[in-house]
Interface confidence: low
């Protein structure tokens, strides 16, 4: 399923994007899954749909639940699910794990902390930043656009960083906060030619016609923060988005950092309702960084149903 977890705090704005993409010209309908009730598009409502975005202005704990978005084009529909949880504000300073966005790590050279989800909102500078609930002060801290830069990073700079900003909707202002952990790496990172862990080169993957199939492209690029590293799938040498087959989609997996400190990425290719013609395609897992590009090719073959004898 194309499902995405989203969370927010009561009385703050929360904006959720449909996990299925489509052209701006496509219409997107939103429903509350439990009741199948359509979400209104009129902006006077506290919860309303605006194209690919679902807006809670402000959010309430009772808004928690699963929301369905359907991207409609002239030739196909794509369905996604947004699993929304709204939490009560904490009275103490601690931010619970379930409210934390992904951890970022920095080093002396690279100490940017991006404010999570901010791109979804209509906000204006400046951003306010807090560390462990204390407002950040001093010349070492610079709020720049949607991120915080810390000069001369030290190990003591590790901790939970919260960004706070104001979302403006038709003249009304709503507060938004988002928190993520920042860790400091002592050792110097390095970058190397991409190493694809999966799939194996020229792998044959068995699939069943009519069933769903997933292919994972996983690669490692070095240690520490990587500048410009990517994994992606291509079909017959064409980007997935350009291939034009809505049954076949790619979805970013988790950024991984293994115990040995290697920075790895993966991209999952999801094929819905496998068809005969899918067996004729060439599936390329590409891993790319500044050193170059590595490609592993996969082909699909039909899995023969096993005869079950009693």
């Amino acid at each position: 399923k194309f499902s995405k977890q989203s969370w927010g705090l009561e009385n703050e704005a929360l904006i959720v994007r449909c996990p299925r993409q489509g052209k701006p010209s496509y219409t997107v309908d939103w429903y509350y899954s439990q009741t199948n009730k359509s979400i209104p598009t009129q902006e006077r409502n506290r919860v309303f749909a605006s194209g690919q975005l679902l807006k809670f202005l402000p959010a309430a704990v009772a808004d928690s639940g699963i929301y369905t978005c359907i991207v409609r084009s002239p030739t196909f529909n794509r369905t996604g699910y947004a699993n929304v949880t709204i939490y009560k504000k904490q009275s103490d300073c601690n931010v619970p794990d379930y409210l934390m966005y992904s951890t970022v790590s920095g080093s002396e050279k690279n100490s940017k902390i991006y404010c999570p989800t901010i791109d979804l909102y209509n906000w204006t500078a400046p951003l306010e930043w807090f560390k462990n609930c204390q407002a950040l002060q001093g010349s070492r801290y610079r709020a720049h656009k949607s991120f915080l830069v810390i000069d001369n990073v030290m190990t003591e700079d590790a901790g939970d960083y919260t960004c706070k900003f104001i979302h403006n909707e038709n003249g009304a202002n709503y507060s938004v906060t988002a928190t993520r952990s920042f860790t400091v790496k002592d050792e110097q990172g390095f970058s190397l030619f991409p190493v694809i862990g999966a799939p194996a080169q020229n792998e044959i993957k068995e699939v069943e016609i009519g069933k769903n199939a997933n292919l994972t492209c996983s690669a490692c690029f070095g240690k520490g923060t990587q500048f410009l590293a990517a994994v992606l799938w291509q079909l017959n040498g064409t980007k997935i988005t350009d291939f034009g087959e809505p049954r076949i989609q790619q979805e970013e997996g988790q950024n991984q950092s293994f115990s040995n400190g290697l920075a790895c990425l993966d991209m999952v290719l999801r094929i819905a309702d496998v068809k005969e013609e899918d067996l004729l395609l060439q599936y390329d897992c590409l891993a790319l960084n500044l050193h170059g590009l590595r490609r592993h090719t996969v082909r699909l073959s039909r899995k023969n149903p096993i005869d079950h004898h009693s």
Partner: antibody, heavy 124, light 108 residues
């Protein structure tokens, strides 16, 4: 450090074709897109198209579609731009440029490296 | 195609002063795909800023970029004599990549 070295100036008759080369050294030629950008005398920059050698992918600006062909030879790290049916308004300096970077979102097509330019004069 | 419009066409500023150049896109462009170039007569363009605000290697700190959506700005904080040139913005958000028509920065 990537260096792009282009072929020399050309004088061509209207209706003919010109093929300009761009040899790369000092970088991973295959991975980076090579774009062609032209500049008519006293005018601004105009993107014509690009090739991503390792993916054998080309894209062209609509204006030049059908008249321009961009190719690449990975073995010599050389890109080529051929423009046919030349007319006087094609008189310009033609640059090759690279440095754009591909990731899962698409192309960050900024050009860090430029050739020295090739003047193509179309005159009868 | 996305049309990039630069203003002003010509900007006259004295050395040591601040120069602000504008670039407007005909439709929204993700800031990751916006670059600025400097070009001097008889030379190839030179990349100054990419990703709307990141300085390219070797570019002095007096050059800075900002903006998002359809409005982008290149600022030169204290003009040096070598900064007088033509400046172009460029988007690579969608094909065809397009450049602005250029802003000529001249000595006042």
């Amino acid at each position: 450090q990537v260096q792009l070295v282009q072929s020399g100036a050309e004088v061509k008759k209207p209706g003919s074709s010109v093929k300009v080369s761009c040899k790369a050294s000092g970088g991973t030629f295959s991975t980076f897109g090579v774009s062609w950008v032209r500049q008519a005398p006293g005018q601004g920059l105009e993107w014509m198209g690009r090739i991503i050698p390792i993916l054998a992918t080309t894209n062209y600006a609509q204006k030049f579609q059908g008249r321009v062909t961009i190719t690449a030879d990975e073995s010599t790290s050389t890109a080529y731009m051929e423009l046919s049916s030349l007319r006087s308004e094609d008189t310009a300096v033609y640059y090759c440029a690279s440095g754009d970077y591909y990731d899962s979102s698409g192309y960050y097509g900024y050009f860090q490296h430029w050739g020295q330019g090739t003047l193509v004069t179309v005159s009868s | 195609e996305i049309v990039m419009t630069q203003s002003p066409a010509t900007l006259s500023v004295s050395p040591g002063e601040r120069a602000t150049l504008s670039c407007r896109a005909s439709q929204s462009v993700s800031s990751s795909y916006l670059a600025w170039y400097q070009q001097k007569p008889g030379q190839a363009p030179r990349l100054l800023i990419y990703g709307a605000s990141t300085r390219a290697t070797g570019i002095p700190a007096r050059f800075s970029g900002s903006g998002s959506g359809t409005e982008f700005t290149l600022t030169i904080s204290s003009l040096q004599s070598e900064d007088f040139a033509v400046y172009y913005c460029q988007q690579s958000y969608s094909i065809p990549f397009t450049f602005g028509q250029g802003t000529k920065l001249e000595i006042k």
